[in-house]
């Protein structure tokens, strides 16, 4: 018979004949022959192959490097890779989450508009008139200036976007 030029799904062409691919989780040891089937072997510990394949080596599971702010979200199997995610307080640098960075803090004069998540960074906003932030924080919003009037006090020092007002006693009129 005429040697094949194309093979069925889950097969590959080698030496003018169609051999079965190895199933996910297994690697190729030897190609099939006229008389023998394709020989495959399961991937070892911490290895995987996620497709029907003719790979002679399995891939190492991804290492979730804590130096890059990563931790294991889902342990890999012989057919799937490990899935990494960010440590608490870190967020991914891209959709694929190959590394993470620490959430940014909002500087004094800025407050947190939106707290960071595992996929998005802190969003800061400048403290408007009447509000202040005197700390660098990834959580704190701008605080309103103290209302001296409600405490029966007067403003001795005006507030800024970085400092609260300073209240003091009212000057008493002498008799």
């Amino acid at each position: 018979p005429e040697p094949p030029t194309a093979c069925r799904e889950k097969q590959y062409l080698i030496n003018s004949q169609c051999c079965s691919l190895c199933q996910p989780g297994q690697k190729l040891v030897s190609d099939c022959t006229e008389f023998t089937e394709t020989e495959c072997l399961p991937c070892g510990e911490s290895e995987f192959l996620d497709t029907w394949n003719r790979e002679t080596h399995c891939h190492q599971h991804k290492y979730c490097d804590p130096n890059l702010g990563l931790r294991v979200q889902q342990k890999g199997t012989s057919e799937t890779d490990t899935i990494c995610t960010c440590e608490e307080g870190w967020h991914c640098t891209s959709e694929a989450c190959e590394s993470c960075v620490l959430h940014r803090s909002c500087s004094p004069g800025f407050g947190v508009k939106q707290i960071a998540t595992g996929v998005s960074d802190t969003i800061c906003e400048p403290c408007p008139v009447g509000f202040f932030s005197n700390v660098s924080s990834a959580f704190e919003k701008c605080h309103p200036w103290t209302s001296c009037e409600t405490k029966d006090l007067v403003v001795q020092q005006a507030g800024t976007n970085k400092t609260d007002v300073v209240c003091g006693p009212q000057d008493r009129l002498r008799a």
């Epitope: 996620d50 891939h59 190492q60 702010g69 890779d81 640098t93 891209s94 959709e95 190959e98 940014r104």
Partner: antibody, heavy 116, light 108 residues
């Protein structure tokens, strides 16, 4: 063993399009991204483009209009095309494992000269 | 556009010297900074990730510090094999994935 190997033309004429291929082994393109970084002779490294393990493409803002990055996970290849080549694009072009991240694994690089 | 400014561009030092290289980002990149060493004709080698964490197999004489916009690479006692060019790289986001201009460390 993880390897990355760049291939493509050694010489390109001005205004032509450069096509470079990075062939990887020892890891899956479904698990790791790949980036292209270049280095003109005697000059600094320049990040050009990256493709994430999810297939998302990223480009350096200064070269975005000239670049296209794509991948074939079955062939284990990542392809970069750069249009309208100029003599200032003469450089060693590297591919490295990773998208928007750090690059612990690099290819040996391929020198591309742009000259008429 | 986002920029990473590295200084000095070159320096001369002797074996045993303490060497410091700085890298400044034009906007905050949190801890998203790496350092590389490159020797002529070779691809760069990763030294530091996350601004201060030593990459696998890197000698402890190398250290990194900083966060936000200002970063430093220090070689505590320069060895003969450390004469090379050093680069910082930011990876905070796709719009800020950039290399610094490099610092060439030469023999005095």
């Amino acid at each position: 063993e993880v390897t990355l190997k760049e291939s493509g033309p050694v010489l390109v004429k001005p205004t032509e399009t450069l096509t470079l291929t990075c062939t990887v082994s020892g890891f899956s393109l479904s698990s790791y991204g790949v980036s292209w970084i270049r280095q003109p002779p005697g000059k600094a490294l320049e990040w050009l483009a990256g493709i994430g393990s999810d297939g998302s493409a990223y480009y350096a803002s200064w070269a975005k209009s000239r670049l296209t990055i794509s991948r074939d996970t079955n062939l284990k290849q990542v392809v970069l095309t750069m249009t309208n080549m100029d003599p200032v694009d003469t450089a060693t072009y590297y591919c490295a494992r990773g998208g928007i991240t750090v690059y612990a694994m690099w290819g040996q690089g391929t020198l591309v000269t742009v000259s008429s | 556009a986002f920029q990473l400014t590295q200084s000095p561009s070159s320096l001369s030092a002797s074996v045993g010297d303490r060497v410091t290289i700085t890298c400044q980002a034009s906007q905050s990149i949190s801890s998203g900074l790496a350092w590389y060493q490159q020797k002529p004709g070779k691809p760069p080698k990763l030294l530091i990730v996350g601004a201060s964490n030593l990459a696998s197999g890197v000698p402890s004489r190398f250290s990194g510090s900083g966060s936000g916009t200002d970063f430093t690479l220090t070689i505590s006692s320069l060895q003969p094999e450390d004469f090379a060019t050093y680069y910082c790289q930011s990876y905070f986001s796709s719009s800020s994935t950039v290399f610094g201009g490099g610092t060439k460390v030469e023999i005095k």
